[in-house]
């Protein structure tokens, strides 16, 4: 008996061939001997089976001695043995229909679990192997689970169902809902405008939800909500914003926040959360702000940074085109009695300058100038 595997929702073609290459009488029946379809001359006739509106043949092939049974929009319960009667012969074909579905929505938040469930006909014993977009293979029986979805799991999952040495392939598109970056850091000189951007790693037709940016300033004992907003069909509207600082927010995606001035009291780290409609859980992105200030008070030239800096960052004070006068893995450096000229304060990581502030030191009888 020939075995054919089908996919739920797809179309399958079961073949039946006569030895004579001409149109002769044929019938397709199911295992209960109920007629599905056949012919009467050049006309297609249908029986009382439950497949009635989903079964057909191909008139153009009958003259070649081919009498296919084509079933569209396959259902698991279409799994059966189908019998083609032609030229006093009976050809049997066993059809097994499988379905593979994601447990919930195919749009899942980063960190959530994906469960794929195989629907199979009674009596079958299939095995399933799925390959994720990043090439990870998982195997299982009726269910396959992947915990802690990552951004790289977004894309087409290819799953192969094996039964009776035959296989059928399913493709499921999974979208992992996340921000492009889990964390970002912005380095600014005091007084500069600060731009925070929160690009999403996915695109959907309609995006609705609400969000909030909580901020923990380095100098503050507790965190505070800087801004709350709504998202409706990719349009952003601000609900509430603090008076200090008074953040501005872009009206379109990607989510974009502007802090008018970088000040030491704002240096710290924030957490932007986005709750999407009809989704449990939230998207998170951490954002950090490091602020630099260079000052000269009497005979002391000082450079300071505030905010979350790593211990390996180097803070230096140097006179332009000269060797660094002072370099430390600390958040403040100073030079006593600096000589006149343009001084640079540099925050660097392994030689790469992250932030730079210049201050002009005038001869001792003048006051300093900050360009």
């Amino acid at each position: 008996k020939k075995v054919v595997l089908g996919k739920k929702g797809d179309t399958v073609e079961l073949t039946c061939t006569a030895s004579q290459k001409k149109s002769i009488q044929f019938h397709w029946k199911n295992s209960n001997q109920i007629k599905i379809l056949g012919n009467q001359g050049s006309f297609l006739t249908k029986g009382p089976s439950k497949l009635n509106d989903r079964a057909d043949s191909r008139r153009s092939l009958w003259d070649q001695g081919n009498f296919p049974l084509i079933i569209k929009n396959l259902k698991i319960e279409d799994s059966d043995t189908y019998i083609c009667e032609v030229e006093d012969q009976k050809e049997e074909v066993q059809l097994l229909v499988f379905g593979l579905t994601a447990n919930s929505d195919t749009h899942l938040l980063q960190g959530q679990s994906l469960t794929l469930t195989l629907e199979s006909p009674p009596g079958s014993s299939p095995s399933v192997q799925c390959r994720s977009p990043r090439g990870k293979n998982i195997q299982g029986g009726k269910t396959l689970s992947v915990s802690q979805l990552e951004l790289q799991d977004s894309g087409t999952w290819t799953c192969t169902v094996l039964q009776n040495q035959k296989k059928v392939e399913f493709k499921i598109d999974i979208v992992v809902l996340a921000f492009q970056k889990a964390s970002s850091i912005v380095y600014k000189k005091e007084g500069e405008q600060v731009e925070f951007s929160f690009p999403l790693a996915f695109t959907v037709e309609k995006l609705t939800g609400s969000g909030e940016l909580w901020w923990q300033a380095e100098r503050a004992s507790s965190s505070k909500s800087w801004i709350t907003f709504d998202l409706k069909n990719k349009e952003v509207s601000v609900k509430r914003v603090t008076q200090d600082p008074k953040l501005q927010m872009g009206k379109k995606l990607p989510l974009h926040l502007t802090l008018p001035q970088a000040l030491p009291q704002y240096a710290g780290s924030g957490n932007l959360t986005l709750a999407l409609e009809a989704k449990t859980g939230k998207l998170h992105q951490e954002v950090n702000l490091v602020v630099m200030r260079a000052t000269q008070l009497q005979k002391n030239l000082t450079c300071e940074v505030w905010g979350p800096t790593s211990p390996k960052l180097m803070l230096s004070l140097k006179l332009e085109n000269k060797e660094a006068k002072v370099s430390k893995r600390e958040k403040a450096v100073w030079v006593l009695n600096p000589e006149a000229g343009m001084w640079q304060c540099l925050l660097s990581d392994s030689g790469q300058v992250l932030l730079e502030s210049n201050i002009k030191v005038l001869p001792t009888w003048s006051t300093p100038v900050q360009p």
């Epitope: 073609e13 073949t15 153009s60």
Partner: antibody
Framework: EVQLVESGGGLVKPGGSLRLSCAAS????????TSWVRQAPGKGLEWVSA???????YYADSVKGRFTISRDDSKNTLYLQMNSLKTEDTAVYYC????????????WGQGTMVTVSS | DIQMTQSPSSLSASVGDRVTITCQAS??????LAWYQQKPGKAPKLLIY???TLESGVPSRFSGSGSGTDFTLTISSLQPEDFATYYC?????????FGGGTKVEIK
């Protein structure tokens, strides 16, 4: 949107080979009969070959033994491998999807030109 | 193979005219016949299948009739966008075959 896009046409010498591709979007190839139909310059339409939902293949006598139709379901792409090309094979080649229960062509590609000339 | 013969091969008509194109099969094909419209440089477009069933989206001024060996395509009131070449095709037996075409031109 349901669409078919052919590619692979070009100029080839008699006796040469060419492989045409037809990429489908908006529907699954393997659920339909799909055909190649050609049209010589200034002439009518001529059916060339078809592949069934179950993978059965059918050819016009004029191309039998020289052309091979195939399908890659994972890429949702239909192919026509044309060998031993003759000058009379010069035509625009269309890929066309057949209706669910009839051999009529409800969706057509834009066509790709094949010129066989020395 | 089933031969399909169309007539006339070309005709001239004016906007608003009633136009009739005929197609004859070399053997009985019941109602397994389709009609297509093709404009220069474009792919054909299905108008009618099973001799008289209008394809979805096709204007109701197009109609088809006939069975056995003789078939007709009628355009009840010709519109400017209807000037094109029309083909019949049998889907009774492989190889599928087309008629030679009828070019409808502006008078």
């Amino acid at each position: 949107e349901v669409q078919l896009v052919e590619s692979g046409g070009g100029l080839v010498k008699p006796g040469g080979s060419l492989r045409l591709s037809c990429a489908a979007s908006g529907f699954t190839f393997s659920n339909h009969y799909t055909s190649w139909v050609r049209q010589a310059p200034g002439k009518g339409l001529e059916w060339v070959s078809a592949i069934g939902a179950g993978g059965g293949t059918y050819y016009a006598d004029s191309v039998k033994g020289r052309f091979t139709i195939s399908r890659d379901d994972s890429k949702n792409t239909l192919y026509l491998q044309m060998n031993s090309l003759k000058t009379e094979d010069t035509a625009v080649y269309y890929c066309a999807r057949e209706g669910w229960n009839d051999d009529v062509f409800d969706i057509w590609g834009q066509g790709t030109m094949v010129t066989v000339s020395s | 193979d089933i031969q399909m013969t169309q007539s006339p091969s070309s005709l001239s008509a004016s906007v608003g005219d009633r136009v009739t194109i005929t197609c004859q099969a070399s053997q009985d094909i019941s109602t397994w016949l389709a009609w297509y419209q093709q404009k220069p440089g474009k792919a054909p477009k299905l108008l009618i299948y099973r001799a008289s069933t209008l394809e979805s989206g096709v204007p109701s001024r197009f109609s088809g009739s006939g069975s056995g060996t003789d078939f007709t395509l009628t355009i009840s009131s010709l519109q400017p966008e209807d000037f094109a070449t029309y083909y019949c095709q049998q889907s009774y037996s492989i190889p599928l075959t087309f008629g030679g075409g009828t070019k409808v031109e502006i008078k």
